[in-house]
């Protein structure tokens, strides 16, 4: 506990002090006081440097004195033989004696008292920056007008902190500018702009004069700019030494001006403004930016449009453009969005054709469709080559996005018909010679396949049975063989409107317009034994001349049998209509003059007894196409005849092409009746 005064006596005082002793006293007076220590008696064995016995006075780490020998007062009015004055409130006294004393020494008597110190004058380091005021037991500092005492209660400075600047433009100067700035001050200014704006500071060299650096290059007075984790400065000297334009890349800036006690100059003045935060002009592949600018800043919006063939995809959907905003952090929004090649996906399959597996389905890729040759060909042109277009569709130069259509090749038998022996007078044939040949089992008759969905036959074949059962692809019509062939199911029968329906068909004498179409429920798959015959063209090239040869085929009556089991065929020439008129009708059901002959009929036969007969009705009279010798077209349909083995009459198909086409077009989709 600190005391104001006290007494210190050597051991056994005033008797002789013992040998080999060491004793210490710790003196402490209250804070703010010094210590006056004085000796009134001193009798200690004398030795050089007081090496044997001594009393030692220590202040902190400093030895204030070391005493030995005898002393007496120089002043008759004062008993003090030795004294010490220390400006500190703590002191240590240590007494030591060695192992032998030649004489008897009495030691010492000392006293201490707390004394006031003048902190303002007693120390080398002045405790106050400006005014120092001493009082007993302490001191206090005070400041001149307009200065304030800092929290350390020693330093004075001007009150130049706490200003926050939020305007987008402004000016800041050191206190009193351009008069000398205050000493011993720390001025802090804060600029806080809206996010998205960066603080830009501009200074002029001549607007800056701050105490220069010391010999080591350290600024004594300094100006520092702090923006987040970036610092600019410290700056000092005559004329601003830093960049005259400081882009802080931050919306928050702290300005710190620190001065010391000496060397005040005029200070500094600066301007600042908020620049919208720039965003980098990024190189986004496969896209264009609109608007295109040299520099983009906070709040700028660009539309990024993908180049043709590229898109932005999210999940299963995509877009060809998007918007991106320059944000307050100097980065673009939607920077994750990238224009990537359009994917057209796996191409659709087509009926009766195929597309090879594409290596890629991305923009620019090419695929090729082919038809199942030789039975199908590409009807709608374009060559079957499609490329993946910018809109995500597979596109053909001719057809656009429309898929190619594989339609049956018509009129080309897999094997040509060769007569081997002299229907009546005809030869055995194979279905591959006449793959269009259709067999009707009730009534026993024929027909001609003209495409996947339609069979052409004679009206008289279907007038009595509007739901005929038909077969294709078999040479033999034996029941066992038919079971293995392709059965065709009709959907609807269309009889020519010019065909007159009779109560008693057996008595018919008028076979004009003997033509009918059967729409099938399902498409027929073509192959070597099943393929259609062509229809005649409308040009004059398809007008038959007398003598033109045609082929007929069927399972009708022969010389030997009422019905043939295996397909028969014959080649016969076109004859003038009068030749048919001249033949006497076998088993007439009416007067010979009652039979009607019209330009809708072709007369053919009469050569070597080759003719069609009962059971061949509806089959095609196939003639070589004048414009393509590899193909046959249905010039006629087996209709009627005066007598088997002579001349026969065939429906002139060319006269009905318009009706056929119209009927097929109007009924191309399945009926819902």
């Amino acid at each position: 506990e600190p005391t104001m005064y006290g007494e210190i006596l050597s051991p056994n005082y005033p008797q002789a002090y013992p040998s080999e002793v060491e004793k210490s006293w710790d003196i402490e007076v209250p804070e703010g006081y010094g210590i006056h220590l004085y000796f009134t008696h001193l009798d200690i064995e004398l030795s050089e440097n007081c090496a044997y016995d001594s009393v030692q006075i220590i202040s902190g780490d400093t030895e204030e004195g070391r005493l030995c020998g005898q002393r007496s007062s120089n002043n008759p009015h004062s008993p003090i033989v030795e004294e010490f004055q220390v400006p500190y409130n703590k002191l240590q006294v240590i007494f030591k004696s060695d192992f032998s004393n030649e004489e008897r020494f009495t030691g010492f008597a000392a006293y201490y008292v707390a004394t006031d110190i003048n902190e303002c004058t007693d120390f080398v380091d002045v405790p106050c920056s400006h005014f120092c005021n001493n009082f007993i037991g302490g001191y206090f500092c005070s400041c001149p007008p307009e200065y304030f005492l800092h929290d350390d209660m020693k330093n004075c400075g001007v009150n130049c902190s706490g200003d926050v600047f939020t305007a987008l433009i402004g000016e800041i100067a050191s206190p009193n500018y351009p008069k000398p700035y205050p000493e011993n001050s720390r001025c802090e200014y804060q600029i806080r702009l809206e996010k998205g704006f960066q603080v830009v500071v501009t200074l002029r060299r001549e607007d800056f004069d701050v105490e220069a650096a010391d010999s080591a290059g350290n600024c004594l007075d300094s100006l520092v700019f702090v923006a987040g984790d970036r610092q600019f400065g410290p700056y000092c000297g005559h004329g601003f030494p830093g960049p005259l334009n400081i882009e802080t890349k931050s919306n928050a800036l702290d300005i710190i001006f620190q001065t010391d006690l000496t060397g005040q100059k005029k200070g500094w003045k600066l301007r600042y403004h908020g620049d919208p935060m720039p965003c980098p002009k990024e190189d986004t592949p496969n896209s264009v930016w609109e608007p295109a600018k040299a520099k983009y800043v906070f709040r700028d919006v660009v539309q990024i449009t993908c180049l043709d063939g590229f898109e932005v995809v999210e999940g299963r959907v995509g877009a060809t453009s998007f918007y991106s905003t320059c944000q307050s952090n100097g980065k673009w929004s939607n920077s994750k969005l990238k224009c990537q090649p359009v994917d057209c996906g796996i191409p659709e399959s087509i009926a009766n054709g195929k597309v090879e597996d594409p290596e890629s389905t991305l923009f620019g890729s090419v695929i090729r469709y082919t038809c199942e040759e030789p039975y199908y060909y590409m009807e709608n042109g374009g060559g079957g080559e499609y490329h993946c277009a910018g809109n995500g569709s597979w596109v053909n130069e001719v057809l656009g996005p429309e898929l190619p259509k594989c339609v049956p090749v018509c009129g080309v038998p897999r094997e040509p018909f060769e007569e081997k022996q002299r229907i009546i007078g005809g030869s055995d044939a194979d279905i591959k010679n006449f793959p269009w040949q259709v067999f009707f089992d009730n009534p026993w008759a024929g027909g001609a396949l003209i495409n996947e969905y339609w069979v052409l036959t004679a009206a008289h074949v279907v007038e009595g049975n509007r739901e005929p059962t038909m077969y294709v692809g078999s040479t033999s019509v034996q029941t066992s063989r038919l079971a293995k062939s392709k059965m065709l199911t009709p959907e609807h029968v269309f009889i020519h409107p010019g065909w007159k329906l009779l109560e008693v068909p057996e008595g018919r004498t008028n076979f004009d317009n003997d033509i009918a179409l059967v729409r099938l429920k399902d498409p027929v798959k073509m192959g070597p034994t099943v393929s259609p015959i062509c229809l005649p063209g409308t040009s004059s090239d398809y007008n038959l001349m007398d003598g033109d040869l045609g082929l007929i085929s069927g399972w009708g009556r022969t010389e030997k049998r009422d019905r043939a089991v295996r397909l028969k065929a014959a080649r016969l020439p076109v004859a003038p209509l009068r030749k048919c008129k001249e033949v006497k009708v076998e088993k007439p059901t009416a007067d010979a003059e009652a039979y009607v002959f019209t330009p809708n009929m072709i007369c053919a036969g009469g050569e070597k007894g080759m003719d069609s007969c009962k059971g061949d009705s509806g089959g095609a009279f196939a003639v070589q196409d004048p414009n393509d010798k590899t193909k046959f077209y249905a010039a006629g349909l087996v209709s009627w005849g005066p007598q088997c083995g002579t001349y026969g009459l065939y429906t002139r198909v060319k006269n009905y092409v318009d009706w056929i086409m119209k009927t097929m077009q109007e009924n191309s989709t399945p009926r819902e009746d």
Partner: antibody, heavy 116, light 107 residues
């Protein structure tokens, strides 16, 4: 399939903070933006902000600036939204949503009730 | 910030009706506008993006149109499951803002 599963309902006192999590599955959050949208009872939708988990860039609506913190942990494929200094008007259902072009997938929502 | 204003705030209609909801932006948002449907107790669901593109799985009776500041969501023939609240949202620039919603109720 894509799913966003949010943490359960919370009851907080005024002045407190709340942290809502949004665990993603079926996709990598680094490839998308993760947004937070809130809906006060019987009110409309209010966008709060987003994070790009790839680089932790965030953008907040001015209204929530200083109170909201959106973070993401790419190792667990989870996004978080912390709202501090809660007041009674912060009582709402908080949704996380994933976007690139649009907000295609949303979490089921987390009800945060602020009551003394 | 861009303000989004929807009208009407609510409307009553019957199954089979044709319904139109409009959304107006306080400034040009080009075509950066999406429409969402929300049913009570559920999260919002995306219907239309980029003003006019139907999101996958959304029935064809929903269509969107408009650009700039005026946008429309049309439901050609209301179905019972369409009664909900509809929100527009601009994604032109942050902050992305929603309209206040249009509640579609059964008449």
């Amino acid at each position: 399939q894509v799913q966003l599963v949010q943490s359960g309902a919370e009851v907080k006192k005024p002045g407190a903070s709340v942290k809502v999590s949004c665990k993603a599955s079926g996709f990598n959050i680094k490839e998308y933006y993760m947004h937070w949208v809130r809906q006060a009872p019987e009110q409309g939708l209010e966008w709060m902000g987003w994070i790009d988990p790839e680089n932790a860039d965030t953008i907040y609506a001015q209204k929530f600036q200083g109170r909201v913190t959106i973070t993401a942990d790419t190792s667990t494929n989870t996004a978080y939204m912390e709202l501090s200094s809660l007041r009674s008007e912060d009582t709402a259902v908080y949704y996380c949503a994933r976007s690139r072009l649009f907000f295609a997938y949303w979490g089921q929502g987390t009800l945060v009730t602020v009551s003394s | 910030d861009i303000q989004m204003t929807q009208s009407p705030k609510s409307l009553s209609a019957s199954v089979g009706d044709r319904v139109t909801i409009t959304c107006r932006a306080s400034q040009d948002v080009r075509t950066a506008l999406d429409w969402y449907q929300q049913k009570p107790g559920q999260s919002p669901k995306l219907l239309i993006y980029s003003a006019s593109y139907r999101y996958s799985g959304v029935p064809s009776r929903f269509s969107g149109s408009g650009s700039g500041t005026d946008f429309t969501l049309t439901i050609s023939s209301l179905q019972p499951e369409d009664f909900a609240t509809y929100y527009c949202q601009q994604q032109y620039t942050t902050p992305y803002t929603f309209g206040q919603g249009t509640k579609l109720e059964i008449k």
